[in-house]
Amino acid sequence: PEPPTACREKQYLINSQCCSLCQPGQKLVSDCTEFTETECLPCGESEFLDTWNRETHCHQHKYCDPNLGLRVQQKGTSETDTICTCEEGWHCTSEACESCVLHRSCSPGFGVKQIATGVSDTICEPCPVGFFSNVSSAFEKCHPWTSCETKDLVVQQAGTNKTDVVCGPQDRLRA
């Protein structure tokens, strides 16, 4: 056979020869020859390779450091890395989730639009007219002002984005 200049998918060119790549979960021990196939070995415990490859060393599984607020979301295999997520009340600081920060709380006058997850922070929104929030919270939405009319009461003090309306009895002296 003529020496190739390009190789098929899942092959690599070395010494004018097309050799098979090692499958995911295995590392390269020795290149193929005209007489032998590529020699591959499975990755060890706590190691992985997630692509067809010619790597001579497997990658170490990611360590989910509890000191950084991390825990294992999905255990790694010989073909996949470990996936870390954050402990309850915390979220990742980056897509790689290398460390965690405490979920942000929404200040009074703001309510939770979207509750935080292990990978995203709390999203707050200002309470619109007719709604309020009087606490700093990572869970509370803006609450609607109390409807005094439905209680047969009148507004004694107008509500704000931080306070509810204050209802009171109707003035019976008024004609």
């Epitope: 020496p3 193929c32 020859t33 005209e34 007489f35 032998t36 196939e37 020699e39």
Partner: antibody, heavy 117, light 107 residues
């Protein structure tokens, strides 16, 4: 037609030397790796040596390493096996075989080497 | 070294019968295995490559299967010229090794 013809076999005393040749024809010799395989009388097949198409890489099992040397002359379409320090257990029919897609796809008819005092 | 164990050592069958020959590797070799046929006084001949790939000029009654450590050569219906010795060979790693052979003889 692919042809491989071995020669150089014969009777040799223990400790002696012998040089086997393999003449190739019918294909582009310089494009193929070639191996030597032997077969002791009434026994199975045993790989002895291999050489890459360019002659730059050679391979041996431990039991012949240091005693046998494989070489080739692509200009002459010829393969060689220099065997030194021969032992009684080297007695066998020696075949040369072409490596096509990592298989021994064509074989010679073999040459008999007898090591005896 | 990868050791190939062939079984049975001898298979006694009649023409027209089906022959099933086994080759077991001491460690996984994917599909890196070839089969050869050898008749008395002749050189071996390549029958099957890469465990199951057919060879041009070899009758269709010869087929191979298996991957990893267990391999099978099947002769669907024995012809008189099929009575011979069959060898498997691995090319997964050095040294290249052959099985001890299975002799298919006439019953």
């Amino acid at each position: 037609e692919v042809q491989l013809v071995e020669s150089g076999g014969g009777l040799v005393k223990p400790g002696g030397s012998l040089r086997l040749s393999c003449a190739a024809s019918g294909f582009t010799f310089s494009n193929y790796g070639i191996s030597w395989v032997r077969q002791a009388p009434g026994k199975g097949l045993e790989w002895v040596s291999s050489i890459s198409s360019g002659g730059d890489n050679t391979y041996y099992p431990d039991n012949v390493k240091g005693r046998f040397t494989i070489s080739r002359d692509n200009a002459k379409n010829s393969l060689y096996l220099q065997m030194n320090s021969l032992r009684a257990e080297d007695t066998a029919v020696y075949y040369c075989a072409r490596a096509g897609e990592k298989a021994m796809d064509y074989w010679g008819q073999g040459t008999l080497v007898t090591v005896s005092s | 070294e990868i050791v190939l164990t062939q079984s049975p050592a001898t298979l006694s069958l009649s023409p027209g019968e089906r022959a099933t020959l086994s080759c077991r590797a001491s460690q996984t070799i994917n599909n890196n295995l070839h089969w050869y046929q050898q008749k008395p006084g002749q050189a071996p001949r390549l029958l099957i490559k890469y465990a199951s790939q057919s060879i041009s000029g070899i009758p269709a009654r010869f087929s191979g299967s298996g991957s990893g450590t267990d391999f099978t050569l099947t002769i669907s219906s024995l012809e008189p010229e099929d009575f011979a010795v069959y060898f498997c060979q691995q090319f997964s790693s050095w040294p290249l090794t052959f099985g001890g052979g299975t002799k298919v003889e006439i019953k």
